[in-house]
Interface confidence: medium
């Protein structure tokens, strides 16, 4: 099996993890998508998921996790705000396609959260705190808590990640508090 690779994010407490999970637009636009954590020796645990079918540009918030699925860009945006040290771990985006196994998107995310310089959350990241406020109107979707253990060891198919590019601005239609729009789609 192909070795699964990881992309590592080293952040401080209080900061925001902001990642993009790109998918093949034609195949998966309306499919339900999820953000999972993978702990050693355990099945991937779903922390948040989009609605079923997934709605375009409609924020879904579960605690400090916000998911936004942009069908026209083939992009699931995942944000974890106000990070805590205990958020450290291995994460992945998946697409639910029952009865088949969930389809994993791109490399996994290795998140390492450390204490802020002054020990106070967000002490070195006030800009992100201001920019990525939690949307005032969000939906909480129901999703399977765990997926099959096969997802842990299964190699991903040849990349379907639409790893995108600079300068494709996304209009975040239901997110009134976001001041700036990311440049990459």
């Amino acid at each position: 099996a192909t070795k699964l690779t990881e992309e590592k994010y080293e952040l401080k407490e209080g900061q925001t993890l902001d990642v993009k999970c790109d998918y093949t637009l034609e195949k998966f636009a309306s499919s339900q998508k999820a953000w999972q954590i993978i702990r050693d020796g355990e099945m991937p645990k779903t922390l948040a998921c989009t609605e079923r079918p997934s709605k375009n540009s409609h924020p879904v918030q579960v605690g400090r996790i916000i998911l936004e699925d942009y069908h026209d860009h083939g992009l699931l945006r995942v944000r974890m705000v106000n990070l805590q040290v205990e958020d450290s771990g291995l994460y992945q985006c998946v697409i639910y396609q029952p009865p088949k196994e969930p389809h994993m998107l791109f490399d996994r995310i290795r998140l390492v959260v450390t204490k802020g310089f002054s020990g106070t959350p967000g002490s070195n990241e006030n800009s992100t705190q201001n920019v990525y406020k939690i949307p005032p109107t969000t939906t909480k979707a129901l999703c399977p808590l765990y997926t099959s253990p096969r997802t842990v060891t299964q190699a991903p198919p040849k990349s379907t990640a639409d790893v995108s590019t600079p300068d494709s601005e996304i209009n975040l239609t239901n997110v009134t508090d976001i001041i700036r729009v990311p440049v990459f789609n």
Epitope: Y9, V19, K20, C21, T24, L25, D162, V163, R180, V183
Partner: antibody, heavy 119, light 108 residues
Amino acid sequence: EVQLVESGGGLVKPGGSLRLSCAASGFTFSSYSMNWVRQAPGKGLEWVSSISSSSSYIYYADSVKGRFTISRDNAKNSLYLQMNSLRAEDTAVYYCARRGGSYDAFQHWGQGTLVTVSS
Amino acid sequence: EIVLTQSPGTLSLSPGERATLSCRASQSVSSSYLAWYQQKPGQAPRLLIYGASSRATGIPDRFSGSGSGTDFTLTISRLEPEDFAVYYCQQAFISPPTFGGGTKVEIK
């Protein structure tokens, strides 16, 4: 292994045209949006243009808008940059680039192709 | 567009020394969208840091990034001979994506 190989550079007179190509391999090209970035001799880097995976979204730097056209052929795993009305200030090494899997930075670059605009 | 100003323009140091490179943005940039690149003569740029502080695959841990808002820093803890090159910062927070003018790290 991701590989990006540019070609098509050369010497052209002001007002002339040139078409650059970028051959991609080692990844599913049709699933990735792509970019052109250039670097004038002895100068810094400048983003030029980008195109989404299905060509639905196309963007240009103001300095090339109306003169350059980005396109792609997913069946051939190729990215193109058609450059018209070339000016001396377009002289540069042109790179095709792809961002990382989940972050907004150019992780993969070609070796570049030199375009010289001179009379 | 966001203008990124890098300083100093040239840094003259010896192998083993610590290098501190600065990148200042004309307006606030979320750290998720700030990257650093290394470029050697005749070569394409190489991604070092993304998200202001995360090292790209294969980058030695002597390279580290930090900062937020308008001020970002790339630090090379102990310069190796292969580290002498030009370094660029780049933002992808506001369209168009822009690069700093570069800092050349040369051997003293």
